[in-house]
């Protein structure tokens, strides 16, 4: 927890942020909360970013004040105006860019005092993998595909039956650059799979970890996948 200290005799108020990650091309949230004030007109929210000339966003006297907003953020930011009164200063960032990564500061002024907290925002691409049986292959083969990742992730296969086994010799992973020249499609193929087993394709970079599971039996195929963002921590 980081407490913003008051300046020139004003009290300090507690401001809390949570480190988070944004998925390139999608909308993201930069989380920030503060001790609420009873009067909306007394609350000022400023979002700043290291390396930015001006402000990312400013909200004061109950509305956006964007005269000093940096051009790179123009039209891409919004606070949750109806939640400011209850202490929510989180910022919605539209169409997240790779270059939006960095250190942000959520700076709050209320009638009670001032406070700020930094937030480390990571950007990249992450998507859910899908594992399928590759019926075109000569032997029993699984194919794990995920459409968008950045930075380049690692791919590891695992199986429920052969726990701890290393599948690197019987798998092949490729990365294909997508049309926007940043994110990549991940394709990993696992050979010599056995029936009545559950296989997992785990894709991970420094932003996210995603797993695609497939259970192949004589009678059916069951699939499951999940994605987890890494390094979300409060300040």
């Amino acid at each position: 927890l980081i407490i913003g200290f008051g300046i020139s005799g004003r009290h300090s108020i507690t401001v809390t942020t949570v480190a988070s990650a944004g998925n390139i091309g999608e909308d993201g949230i930069l989380s920030c909360t503060f001790e609420p004030d009873i009067k909306l007109s007394d609350i000022v929210i400023q979002w700043l970013k290291e390396g930015v000339l001006g402000l990312v966003h400013e909200f004061k006297e109950g509305k956006d004040e964007l005269s000093e907003q940096d051009e790179m953020f123009r039209g891409r930011t919004a606070v949750f105006a109806d939640q400011v009164i209850v202490g929510n200063a989180s910022l919605r960032l539209k169409n997240v860019q790779l270059t939006d990564a960095g250190t942000y500061k959520c700076y709050i002024i209320t009638s009670k005092g001032k406070g700020n907290a930094n937030l480390e925002y990571k950007t990249g691409a992450f998507s859910m993998p899908e594992v399928n049986v590759d019926y075109n292959a000569s032997s029993e083969t699984l194919r794990c595909e995920a459409p968008r990742w950045f930075p380049q992730p690692t791919v590891v296969w695992a199986s429920q039956v052969d726990q701890g086994a290393n599948f690197s010799e019987v798998s092949n992973t490729s990365f294909e650059l997508n049309s926007e020249n940043v994110t990549m499609k991940v394709v990993s193929v696992l050979y010599n799979v056995t029936i009545n087993n559950t296989y997992s394709c785990m894709i991970e970079n420094d932003i996210a970890k995603a797993t695609g599971d497939i259970k192949v039996t004589e009678s059916e195929i069951k699939r499951r996948s999940h994605l987890q963002l890494l390094n979300s921590k409060a300040s």
């Epitope: 001006g54 402000l55 005269s67 907003q69 940096d70 860019q97 790779l98 270059t99």
Partner: antibody, heavy 118, light 107 residues
């Protein structure tokens, strides 16, 4: 067409002061952040100052803080750099650079030369 | 400060060659890097922004690549007007910092 024209350079004695100007045209000046960059005689580039679109936020390298002051007059479409306590190492060609839609160094002026010598 | 180490400082190349100029940042800069061209006695022209994006009006023989702390400017099929000085600049952190420059000369 975006145009940035610097002026005000010249020969100054060590310890002296000088104010540079950058006249902008061809774009909505008040919308964009601006910077001053200098190029030393050895062709090394150094960012000198930056200012937000409205002029309320200014930024400097620690090495120049206190001696250099950047300002802007959006009504006149002009950027300024006030320099004081000048030293021989401030001798350089000074360029103004405008942020465009893409980044902080999209457009550049032709530069104005400052020589600090006794 | 973020130190930008640019290499090579100069290179002699022939027309039609492909060249690569690299910049290494002393810390990650999240693609907040631009590439600039300066012709003798002239000002600067922006070529690449955000590491990989081509500025409007810049020929497609120029391209940028990289991520994290390492970035490159690639010029394919060099033409006579490409012989100039090239600089990288990072705008991820204050103070903004520039590479030392690369002089492209005709062999």
């Amino acid at each position: 067409e975006v145009q940035l024209v610097e002026s005000g350079g010249g020969l100054v004695k060590p310890g002296g002061s000088l104010k540079l100007s950058c006249a902008a045209s061809g774009f909505t000046f008040s919308r964009y952040a601006m910077s001053w960059v200098r190029q030393t005689p050895e062709k090394r580039l150094e960012w000198v100052a930056g200012i937000s679109s409205g002029g309320s936020y200014t930024y400097y390298p620690d090495t120049l803080k206190g001696r250099f002051t950047v300002s802007r007059d959006n009504a006149r479409n002009t950027l300024y750099l006030q320099m004081s306590s000048l030293r021989s190492e401030d001798t350089a060609k000074y360029f103004c650079a405008s942020q465009g839609s893409n980044h902080y160094f999209d457009y550049w002026g032709q530069g104005t030369t400052l020589t600090v010598s006794s | 400060d973020t130190l930008m180490t640019q290499s090579p400082s100069s290179m002699s190349v022939s027309l039609g060659d492909t060249v690569s100029i690299t910049c290494h940042a002393s810390q990650g800069i999240h693609n907040n890097i631009g590439w600039l061209q300066q012709k003798p006695g002239k000002s600067f022209k922006a070529l690449i922004y955000h590491g990989t994006n081509l500025e409007d009006g810049v020929p497609s023989r120029f391209s940028g690549s990289g991520s994290g702390a390492d970035y490159s400017l690639i010029i394919s099929s060099l033409e006579s007007e490409d012989f100039a000085d090239y600089y990288c600049v990072q705008y991820a952190q204050f103070p903004y910092t520039f590479g030392g420059g690369t002089k492209l000369e005709i062999k």
